[in-house]
């Protein structure tokens, strides 16, 4: 859909990973003066939400409150702007935003090889494992928008595991992992306990780096 206006932006506050029963704000905004914003969840016929746009300093926006979070609220969202109502003249869609519900199943374990403290430039691998038969593991880094996803390997010693090679360490961070099942890509487990990875002998040991995106800028198209 091309739209009569360029696409608005869609952000999740505080982020796109939402604990069960908690609320997330999806903010649709644009520098086009839209009078109306619509929020649509992919594949849903009934649940398109409509809000009147607010205008401040050349920006129009609408804050859609989604929650308390349940399985049927998770999914891929897009927002649209319109300067008219009945009929709407919709803009191009925002980039898609995957909203994930977490806290549904038992937490996996997260560990680091060779260990959570590594020398700068040394390779580090994070391993996520669980006795639950998760098909997929997701690794998130605090303050970063993009999760990484790996398929769980075959059962070994009673656990299902995925390894995330981080490559040569440059600066540390706090990591968490989640498990999910193939048939429910938007429904994730409880978070693992956080794992702090520290890099020693590195001048830029501060984290996150100033160029990294914040957790509210949306997340990638990788759930399907």
């Amino acid at each position: 859909h091309e739209g009569v206006h360029r696409k608005p932006s869609l952000l999740a506050h505080p982020g796109p990973l939402v604990k069960s029963e908690e609320t997330v704000i999806l903010q649709c905004w644009s520098d086009v003066r839209f009078q109306h914003f619509l929020l649509h969840r992919e594949g849903k016929f009934k649940d398109t939400l409509h809000l009147i746009g607010e205008h401040h300093d050349g920006v129009s926006k609408a804050n859609f409150s989604i929650g308390p979070m349940m399985q049927d609220l998770a999914g891929t969202y897009r927002c649209y702007g319109s300067v008219t109502h009945s009929p709407y003249q919709l803009s191009a869609p925002s980039d898609p935003l995957d909203i994930v519900i977490t806290g549904l199943y038992e937490k996996p374990s997260l560990s680091a090889q060779p260990g959570p403290t590594v020398l700068a430039g040394e390779s580090v691998t994070l391993s996520c494992s669980s006795r639950s038969s998760y098909d997929m593991y997701h690794l998130s880094r605090e303050g970063e928008a993009h999760e990484r996803r790996f398929s769980a390997g075959p059962k070994v010693n009673g656990t299902f595991q995925a390894d995330f090679p981080l490559g040569p360490a440059t600066h540390g961070g706090t990591y968490r992992c989640f498990g999910s099942f193939r048939d429910s890509p938007y429904e994730w487990s409880n978070s693992s306990d956080p794992l702090l990875v520290s890099v020693t002998g590195n001048p830029s040991n501060s984290w996150p780096s100033p160029t990294e995106p914040s957790s509210e800028t949306g997340n990638p198209r990788h759930l399907h």
Epitope: L38, E42, F45, T48, D72, P87, Y88, Q89, L90
Partner: antibody
Framework: EVQLVQSGAEVKKPGSSVKVSCKAS????????ISWVRQAPGQGLEWMGG????????NYAQKFQGRVTITADESTSTAYMELSSLRSEDTAVYYC?????????????WGRGTLVTVSS | QSVLTQPPSASGTPGQRVTISCSGS????????VNWYRQLPGTAPKLLIY???QRPSGVPDRFSGSKSGTSASLAISGLQSEDEADYYC???????????FGGGTKVTVLA
């Protein structure tokens, strides 16, 4: 003025398929939701499913899942409902109805209906 | 068997008030708004009440809707002969993921 113009009456054999069209005028077709509702002779209304052309989203009532296909052609402002594996119980008047994007299930305009008769 | 339950018929004399009930469950009326449609013989249905109690423009204020819990009702006051029609309630059902209708109520205006 909004109008939903439906295709003409059809007589079909059991086991065959029927495709009913609904051409919209007087509005931005793609920015609305189109539903299909049927009514068997002397019976009540039954929602079959709907489509929002701009979102490419089609939803089907569980009863018709796998047997009905709802599509839309934005270039001609026309929605279609195809029902397969017809049986005598599918003899009914088939209506298309329009809703706003954010009130997709509030049917504010209706077509006049298309009578589909299934008979051997 | 319709998901929403309506009485099959209702009647009254001109000028009277007639009320039609529509009973559902927590997955439809209990958690979603109710719309009412009126169907004159041989014609397509027409929206009469939306969002429980709102009238589209052109619908006289003799028609009113209400909702409480898992039930809704439509009231017609000052009944007129042209009100003879079938009346249907409808709501979204979260469990069925679709629109459900009542079986319809035939309103007769007695001479």
């Amino acid at each position: 003025e909004v109008q939903l113009v439906q295709s003409g009456a059809e007589v079909k054999k059991p086991g065959s398929s029927v495709k009913v069209s609904c051409k919209a005028s007087g509005g931005t077709f793609s920015s609305y939701a189109i539903s299909w509702v049927r009514q068997a002779p002397g019976q009540g209304l039954e929602w079959m499913g709907g489509i929002i052309p701009i979102f490419g989203t089609a939803n089907y009532a569980q009863k018709f899942q796998g047997r009905v296909t709802i599509t839309a052609d934005e270039s001609t402002s026309t929605a279609y409902m195809e029902l397969s594996s017809l049986r005598s119980e599918d003899t009914a008047v088939y209506y298309c109805a329009r809703g706003e994007l954010d009130t997709a299930i509030r049917f504010d305009y209706w077509g006049r209906g298309t009578l589909v008769t299934v008979s051997s | 068997q319709s998901v929403l339950t309506q009485p099959p018929s209702a009647s009254g004399t001109p000028g009277q008030r007639v009320t039609i009930s529509c009973s559902g469950s927590s997955s439809n009326i209990g958690s979603n708004t109710v719309n009412w449609y009126r169907q004159l013989p041989g014609t397509a249905p027409k929206l009469l009440i939306y969002s429980n109690n709102q009238r589209p423009s052109g619908v006289p204020d003799r028609f009113s809707g209400s909702k409480s819990g898992t039930s809704a009702s439509l009231a017609i006051s000052g009944l007129q002969s042209e009100d003879e029609a079938d009346y249907y309630c409808a709501a979204w059902d979260d469990s069925l993921n679709g629109v459900v209708f009542g079986g319809g109520t035939k309103v007769t205006v007695l001479a």
